[in-house]
């Protein structure tokens, strides 16, 4: 029986060009974590395997860094990074737990400030 719960950072926002840490935490279970997958919509970003450590998908190698812990750091954020992110915990004997994070990437405050106070 699956007794665990996944706590996530929930809905978060970050500035364009900056970085953000995606974090999930599995609690209330003694199940052994085999692997944690990080996905953006349906694209696999990274895997943290209990045996073998981290594997970052080649297409994200430049902008994704492993950690801290089982979390994932996204760097050089663009507006296109806005969307849903999922942490998928493969555990034994429980099975698969999924957590969801929504990231909104905002134009930097400098850009917003400049846009608001344009001289006609």
């Amino acid at each position: 029986m699956m007794t665990g719960t996944i706590e996530t950072t929930g809905n978060i926002s970050a500035e364009k060009g900056g970085s953000i840490i995606l974090q999930c935490h599995l609690s209330s279970t003694t199940a052994q974590v085999t692997q944690v997958n990080w996905e953006q919509q349906d694209q696999l970003l990274a895997i943290c395997n209990a045996d073998l450590g981290w594997h970052i998908s080649p297409s994200f190698k430049d902008r994704v860094a492993p950690g801290p812990g089982l979390g994932l750091t996204l760097q050089s954020l663009t507006v296109n990074d806005t969307g849903e992110y999922f942490c998928i915990y493969h555990t034994y004997p429980d099975g698969t737990y999924t957590g969801r994070i929504f990231l909104e990437v905002l134009e930097s405050s400098v850009a917003e400030h400049g846009a608001r106070f344009q001289i006609p």
Epitope: M2, Q32, T34, I47, N49, A50, D51, L52
Partner: antibody, heavy 119, light 107 residues
Framework: EVQLVESGGGLVQPGGSLRLSCAAS????????MSWVRQAPGKGLEWVAT????????YYADSVKGRFTISRDNSKNTLYLQMNSLRAEDTAVYYC????????????WGQGTLVTVSS | DIQMTQSPSSLSASVGDRVTITCRAS??????LSWYQQKPGKAPKLLIY???KSHTGVPSRFSGSGSGTDFTLTISSLQPEDFATYYC?????????FGQGTKLEIK
């Protein structure tokens, strides 16, 4: 090209032992979770056991727990299934299978090896 | 254990037909469902994973859908090589159970 070739099947008496092997090629064997799945004659598929890439973690179906041992030798690119205290209901074709890196499904399977438990 | 029930158990169809096979889980399995094709005397082949993702090299006529407890595998236009047995498998919780299979035969 990914290839998985099982061997070691045969006829064994109830209570006997058998060791199955699965020789892997065409991929980085040590990076992938592997499993054994069996299929009794004319029946469906049954998951038997799984082992992590480094061999640290092993998982078993209740029907084989305590009797079967899954292991791997990454230096030889080979997966094993040691089967002890065999029963008639263990009669099946045994397949080794490689999981996707994501661990979402078994993407390649061997051709299978038949194990017959009979007196 | 999660029980996986496929329907129908067998199905007769003709080349060119559109065919749908359903798989029902005894409890919520989110999208953790795979579909496999098996021909007599051969090993299973992965068609679909994560309910709707096509495995590399699988013809586009095969598609999967569903989430929660109800899933479908659709073959849009049957080809002669598609006559086989199809299995669903859940990856939500151990043991990772399979459906009993659907045998697709030539009408």
């Amino acid at each position: 090209e990914v290839q998985l070739v099982e061997s070691g099947g045969g006829l064994v008496q109830p209570g006997g032992s058998l060791r199955l092997s699965c020789a892997a090629s065409g991929f980085t064997f040590s990076s992938y979770i592997m499993s054994w799945v069996r299929q009794a004659p004319g029946k469906g598929l049954e998951w038997v056991a799984t082992i992590s890439g480094g061999g640290t973690n092993t998982y078993y179906a209740d029907s084989v727990k305590g009797r079967f041992t899954i292991s791997r030798d990454n230096s030889k690119n080979t997966l094993y299934l040691q089967m002890n205290s065999l029963r008639a209901e263990d009669t099946a074709v045994y397949y080794c299978a490689k999981w996707l890196l994501s661990y979402y499904a078994m993407d390649y399977w061997g051709q299978g090896t038949l194990v017959t438990v009979s007196s | 254990d999660i029980q996986m029930t496929q329907s129908p158990s067998s199905l007769s169809a003709s080349v060119g037909d559109r065919v749908t096979i359903t798989c029902r889980a005894s409890q919520n399995i989110n999208v953790w469902l795979s579909w496999y094709q098996q021909k007599p005397g051969k090993a299973p082949k992965l068609l679909i994973y994560k309910a709707s993702k096509s495995h590399t090299g699988v013809p586009s006529r095969f598609s999967g859908s569903g989430s929660g407890t109800d899933f479908t595998l659709t073959i849009s236009s049957l080809q002669p090589e598609d006559f086989a047995t199809y299995y669903c498998q859940q990856g939500q919780s151990y043991p990772y159970t399979f459906g009993q299979g659907t045998k697709l035969e030539i009408k």
